[in-house]
Interface confidence: medium
């Protein structure tokens, strides 16, 4: 969804994609109050049997401008002895999220809603052994 | 972000900040193309050593209207023998997401962006043993 300011400097769009009587302000509300904002970063990424690292994905023309993307540290899982277990795989859990993206080319402060697929963390699954026919 | 209609019954936004008064294009763009829409549901939720279930959170006045929320099936993790391992905990991996929410019924063309905290999947971590002083 492109978010386009009513500004004389911007071309008027008559496309079917725009609703004239729907307006947006970009203040973001927390539906869960302090539960969202104040939660401390989890240490699960280090303590997990399928540990992961977080990579900073930054885009000043996007809200949120910083998204942390998970990547599994190992292909295998870590066992109780701290060794890699070759029967178990670390796999990435992904989720589709909505972001607001600014389109700098078209007109100042033109945004659209985009779907992004991001890695959130890793989990440990048993390797699937392919049986010979 | 409230999406505010030009309507006498609804609050008129005359704020100096023109980001509070923007048009919305009705399309949602996939930044990753077909990679997002066409991906098949993962079977990790059953195969994981920290399996989880997905609960349907539905709200017709929200976009996305259906959000699947993960809950860990067990407090502990499942070992190679399929038994619960009392030294290992299943923990929920959560992520903050953006959703669009309709404002009160009195003003049906008004929406806002909300942050929601959702469970995405579970991972297995070593229990933290508290040492006696």
């Amino acid at each position: 969804a492109a978010i386009i300011p009513q500004s004389s400097a911007c071309p008027n769009t008559e496309a079917k994609d725009f609703l004239q009587n729907v307006k947006v302000n970009l203040k973001v509300f927390n539906s869960l109050g302090a539960k969202v904002s104040s939660r401390r970063p989890s240490d699960y990424l280090n303590r997990s049997t399928s540990p992961w690292t977080l990579h900073r994905n930054e885009d000043p023309d996007r809200y949120p401008s910083v998204i942390w993307e998970a990547q599994c540290r190992h292909q295998r899982c870590v066992n109780a002895e701290g060794k890699l277990d070759h029967h178990m795989n670390s796999v990435l859990i992904q989720q589709e999220i909505l972001v607001l993206k600014r389109e700098p080319e078209s007109c100042p402060f033109t945004f659209r809603v985009e779907k992004m697929l991001v890695g959130v963390g890793c989990t440990c699954v048993a390797s699937i052994v392919r049986q010979a026919a | 972000a409230a999406i505010i209609p030009q309507s006498s019954a609804c609050p008129n936004t005359e704020a100096k900040d023109f980001l509070q008064n923007v048009k919305v294009n009705l399309k949602v763009f996939n930044s990753l193309g077909a990679k997002v829409s066409s991906r098949r549901p993962s079977d990790y939720l059953n195969r994981s050593t920290s399996p989880w279930t997905l609960h349907r959170n539905e709200d017709p006045d929200r976009y996305p209207s259906v959000i699947w929320e993960a809950q860990c099936r067990h407090q502990r993790c499942v070992n190679a023998e399929g038994k619960l391992d009392h030294h290992m905990n299943s923990v929920l991996i959560q992520q903050e997401i953006l959703v669009l929410k309709r404002e009160p019924e009195s003003c049906p063309f008004t929406f806002r962006v909300e942050k929601m905290l959702v469970g995405v999947g579970c991972t297995c971590v070593a229990s933290i043993v508290r040492q006696a002083a």
Epitope: A1, L19, V22, V24, V113 | I3, V24, L26, K27, V28, P60, D61, R62, Y63, P64, S65, L100, R102, E105, F111
Partner: nanobody, 119 residues
Framework: EVQLVESGGGLVQPGGSLRLSCAAS????????MYWVRQAPGKGLEWVAE????????YYVDSVKGRFTISRDNAKNSLYLQMNSLRAEDTAVYYC????????????WGQGTLVTVSS
Amino acid sequence: EVQLVESGGGLVQPGGSLRLSCAASGFTFSSYSMYWVRQAPGKGLEWVAEIKQDGSVQYYVDSVKGRFTISRDNAKNSLYLQMNSLRAEDTAVYYCAKGEILPLYFDYWGQGTLVTVSS
């Protein structure tokens, strides 16, 4: 294949009435909110009315409240817009649309039906 076909438009005098219909096929009609949207000549698109899945809740833009009534018949996969006390400013192409919450997108549109209010 999803199809939405509008009908019922035409020329009517101010103060007159029309009933628009939208025949839906190719999807489970009863599972979706449905919408009427209009586009006046040379103007942008305007959200006119919405009806929830079971027909229990309807929303209208202020300019048509008390004059227009949106309804649906899930057994017939049909959406309706009863338009009374029509005014010149109601002249537009009227589209029916299906989708999730409206400000983001419509999954599908009809081809539209033209309503002209003129004496």
